[in-house]
């Protein structure tokens, strides 16, 4: 026989020959970095037709890297589903705690010996630091001076020194999340109110009241013979102003006896399919909407349209 | 939390064959191996084996080769154990358990009784 | 194949006393990186088997620190510094360096 195979997990005991007689036997052993777990036979023959008898290395195993729990509160997972050297332990923690250290560890040879490349990290709670403190209000547990992961804390205003009281502005309640960090912003408080909304030729038909503070919503709408212009509900936003705008009552023209040119529908004021009436932003048309509110035919003003692109 | 829940009792004739089942959950099936310990009446524990859930990758003990199968089936997260021509010394509590080669039981199953009897 | 004996294969014991466990290797189970090789398991009546101490010494998730393994090569000692009820069962050593196997287990009862 000629030399016997090689194999990458074990290597020949000696010095290969350039020949071997009939009979003669070989013995491996496992390779730096392998260990040999029985029973499989690590030995060939060279047999009479001038091969080896059939023999593998499936008894030598890579060395493997010490068992590393599960951090307390977390997850350690190999990767590559093996603690064998080359490959990787992952660790990750459970939901409310964050990781101190390595996140992934190797599995390293160094000699013949299998070790991880560091130590294995922790998984410590997820604490935040108090809430920011706000102007004319407070906060729940203002007295804690540490707060765990999820704990939430709710803000309220104070009472106002004046006739108007104090609105709460943004979220009321916020909680500790995953970074340390709280979920929003802190909310403010501070004095909102709106004008007395007024729209001629129309009238208000819900959200009555003397005051309007924040979040205040009224609901308008037109006189006979005359259409909305905005949006038919408003409501009084963090900087004292109606949004959408106060809408106006325009009059309705009355139905002019020229026939209109034919329009295309790319002259609308939105790629929707409502009225110009009930667009709240984008440019104005200067024709008005006749009163049947079917946006494909306008009536121009006076028979004509100002301008056509 | 991490489980390894087993397949039911079973009678077995001598000579027939038994599978039974080890159904994970709570971790990544496919990152550790199963082993498979048994347990005759009122006697210690017996390592059967190991599967690598990862490879497919087997080891079985001495005393079992050529008689006991290890398979896994990573789609359902469930290891297999599957014994043959059983004789009346088969009869035990069988175990899986979550570990490496090299490495430690840290999780069980609740075990499954096989008793081989005429 | 490596062998494990343990002694005393009973243990009778007293709630609050200390109890020990020695379990002998055929050969060494101190592998070249620095670490043995050696698991304790404790079996409680009816229950699975459940990890104790790994690698000879390190105690395992949500092992009370009454348990701790000591030793090296073929000596490896369990030690229960107070014993309580819930520890009565059937205490395993394993070894993990050739393949796995057991020793003969060491029954704790109360006295």
């Known amino acids: 026989c000629e030399e016997p195979p090689t194999f990458e997990a074990m290597e020949l005991i000696g010095k290969p020959k350039p020949y071997y007689e009939i009979g003669e036997r070989v013995d491996y052993k496992c390779k730096k970095g392998y260990f040999y777990i029985p029973p499989l036979a690590t030995h060939t023959i060279c047999d009479r037709n001038h091969t080896w008898l059939p023999v593998s290395d499936d008894a030598c195993y890579r060395e493997t890297c010490p068992y590393i729990r599960d951090p307390l509160n977390g997850q350690a997972v190999p990767a590559n589903g093996t603690y064998e050297f080359g490959y990787q332990m992952h660790f990750i923690c459970n939901e409310g705690y964050y990781l101190i250290g390595e996140e992934i560890l190797y599995c390293e040879l160094k000699g013949s010996v299998a070790i991880w490349s560091g130590k294995p990290p922790i998984c410590e709670k997820v604490l935040c630091t108090p809430p920011p403190k706000i102007k004319n209000g407070k906060h729940t547990f203002s007295e804690v001076e540490v707060f765990e992961y999820l704990d939430a804390v709710t803000y309220s205003c104070d009472p106002a020194p004046g006739p108007d009281p104090f609105s709460l502005i943004g979220e009321s309640t916020i909680y500790c999340g995953d970074n340390s960090v709280w979920s929003r912003a802190a909310p403010e408080c501070k004095v909102v109110k709106c004008r007395f909304p007024v729209v001629e030729n129309g009238k208000q038909i819900s959200g009555f009241g003397k005051k309007f503070y924040y979040k205040a919503t009224v609901m308008f709408e037109c006189d006979k013979g005359f259409y909305l212009d905005g949006s038919d509900t408003i409501v009084c936003d963090s900087n004292s102003t109606w949004d959408p705008p106060v809408p106006k009552c325009l009059k309705v023209l009355p139905p002019s006896s020229t026939k209109p040119p034919a329009l295309s529908h790319s002259v609308s004021t939105s790629s929707t399919t409502k009225s110009p009436a009930s667009s709240a932003s984008g440019p104005r048309p200067t024709y008005k909407p006749p009163v049947s509110n079917y946006p494909g035919y306008p009536k121009p003003e006076e028979g004509i349209l100002d301008s056509l692109d | 939390q991490v489980q390894l829940v087993q397949s039911g009792a079973e009678v077995k004739k001598p000579g027939a064959s038994v599978k039974v089942s080890c159904k994970a959950s709570g971790y990544t099936f496919t990152s550790y191996g199963i082993s498979w310990v048994r347990q005759a009446p009122g006697q210690g524990l017996e390592w059967m084996g190991w599967?690598?859930?990862?490879?497919?990758?087997?080891n079985y003990a001495q005393k079992l080769q050529g008689r006991v199968t290890m398979t896994t089936d990573t789609s359902t997260s469930t290891a297999y154990m599957e014994l043959r021509s059983l004789r009346s010394d088969d009869t035990a509590v069988y175990y899986c358990?979550?570990?490496?080669?090299?490495?430690?039981?840290?999780?069980w199953g609740q075990g499954t009784l096989v008793t081989v009897s005429t | 194949e490596i062998e494990l004996t343990q002694s005393p294969l009973s243990l009778p014991v007293t709630p609050g006393e200390p109890a020990s466990i020695s379990c002998r290797s055929s050969?060494?189970?101190?592998?070249?990186?620095?670490?043995?090789?050696l698991d304790w398991y404790l079996q409680k009546p009816g229950q699975s088997p459940q990890l104790l101490i790994y690698?000879?010494?390190n105690r395992a998730s949500g092992v009370p620190d009454r348990f701790s393994g000591s030793g090296s090569g073929t000596d490896f000692t369990l030690k229960i510094s107070r014993v309580e009820a819930e520890d009565v069962g059937v205490y395993y050593c394993?070894?993990?360096?050739?393949?796995?196997?057991f020793g003969p287990g060491t029954k704790v009862e109360i006295k």
């Open positions: 394993m070894q993990a360096l050739q393949t796995f196997t």
């Open positions: 358990a979550r570990g490496m080669m090299r490495g430690v039981f840290d999780y």
């Open positions: 599967i690598s859930a990862y490879n497919g990758n087997t």
């Open positions: 050969q060494s189970l101190l592998h070249s990186n620095g670490y043995n090789y």
């Open positions: 690698l000879g010494s």
